[in-house]
């Protein structure tokens, strides 16, 4: 991915900026969390090393009525080259266990921070 649209600033956004904004949003979610995130809703755990952005979106898109992660869902859609809709989960994707959204966000944040430090913006 060389440019991404639909984020805070207008027009094309450099991948490093888009990734930083996604990280900032996830930090915001984890720091502002008081009650259980998304009422304790659970999502499919994903492999963070393979097709992560689309897989993360496919998992999180199934959480409805949770305003806290709506921005994250929109931002992830900018990283995923194909359209993802609720209920869609590739049969090739592992569906092994569900974890709470809060744990999912925390793990995703840790992984994205690692990618950012290593300069892997795409």
């Amino acid at each position: 991915l060389t440019c991404l649209g639909g984020f805070a600033s207008p027009g094309p956004v450099p991948p490093s900026t888009a990734l930083r904004e996604l990280i900032e949003e996830l930090v915001n979610i984890t720091q502002n969390q008081k009650a259980p995130l998304c009422n304790g809703s659970m999502v499919w755990s994903i492999n963070l090393t393979a097709g992560m952005y689309c897989a993360a979106l496919e998992s999180l898109i199934n959480v409805s009525g949770c305003s806290a992660i709506e921005k994250t869902q929109r931002m992830l859609s900018g990283f995923c080259p194909h359209k993802v809709s609720a209920g869609q989960f590739s049969s090739l994707h592992v569906r092994d266990t569900k974890i709470e959204v809060a744990q999912f966000v925390k793990d995703l944040l840790l992984h994205l921070k690692k990618l950012f430090r290593e300069g892997q913006f795409n």
Epitope: N39, G40, S41, M42, S45, I46, N47, L48, T49, A50, S91, L92, V94, R95, D96, T97, K98, I99, E100
Partner: antibody
Framework: QVQLKESGPGLVAPSQSLSITCTVS????????VNWVRQPPGKGLEWLGI???????DYNSALKSRLIINKDNSKSQVFLKMNSLQTDDTARYFC??????????????????WGQGTSVTVSS | DVQMIQSPSSLSASLGDIVTMTCQAS??????LNWFQQKPGKAPKLLIF???NLEDGVPSRFSGSRYGTNFTLTISSLEDEDMATYFC?????????FGGGTKLEIK
């Protein structure tokens, strides 16, 4: 200690529905998934479905139209309802806890504790 | 659905023998395999999870390994109490599916 115990009707008439209760102790239903698995006499095991800690469910697609799994967290009970029973639904029905662990890059599940099962015969 | 082909369907071995049985997945990568032991009239008991992790309280003579989509359960020195039927389960692709079982008898 962790325990699961199934209770069911034993005998069900063809075309009728089956209701089984799994009562658990030693863990909270909000923190674990609970599976339903069945085993026809002398045969192998078949996964029916799971209810997760948040109450969401996933079913075996082959049986999805006939199954409902729900639970009462406060009573530590999980319920299986199966409609339109036929003789080939005769089996021992088990509930089993699903425990999460981290493996191969992400979270996985394992069926670590099982109930002793309840036998269901479909016959007129 | 992912089919789990388990072999052999039955086997007979002597006390102290090394026993192996296998499960092969029809498709899928990164499969989380569980192995269970079931004795007549009893519930299945978890032995191995994640293909090679020994469940707490399970004797160390049981071990699991994986090579691609092939999974093996090995009993290093067969004991009388190991007479049972063994099932594998793939816990990774819905619907989760079990192998047909391997019935182990003592010679």
């Amino acid at each position: 200690q962790v325990q699961l115990k199934e209770s069911g009707p034993g005998l069900v008439a063809p075309s009728q529905s089956l209701s089984i209760t799994c009562t658990v102790s030693g863990f909270s239903l909000t923190g674990y998934g609970v599976n339903w698995v069945r085993q026809p006499p002398g045969k192998g095991l078949e996964w029916l479905g799971i209810i997760w800690g948040d109450g969401s469910t996933d079913y075996n697609s082959a049986l999805k139209s006939r199954l409902i799994i729900n639970k009462d967290n406060s009573k530590s009970q999980v319920f299986l309802k199966m409609n339109s029973l036929q003789t080939d639904d005769t089996a021992r029905y088990f509930c089993a806890r699903d425990k999460t662990f981290y493996y191969d890059g992400f979270y996985r599940g394992r069926m670590d504790y099982w109930g002793q099962g309840t036998s269901v015969t479909v016959s007129s | 659905d992912v089919q789990m082909i388990q072999s052999p369907s039955s086997l007979s071995a002597s006390l102290g023998d090394i026993v192996t049985m296998t499960c092969q997945a029809s498709q899928g990568t990164s499969i989380n395999l569980n192995w269970f032991q079931q004795k007549p009239g009893k519930a299945p008991k978890l032995l191995i999870f994640g293909a090679s992790n020994l469940e707490d309280g399970v004797p160390s003579r049981f071990s699991g390994s994986r090579y691609g989509t092939n999974f093996t359960l090995t009993i290093s020195s067969l004991e009388d109490e190991d007479m049972a039927t063994y099932f594998c389960l793939q816990h990774s692709y819905l619907p989760w599916t079990f192998g047909g079982g391997t019935k182990l008898e003592i010679k």
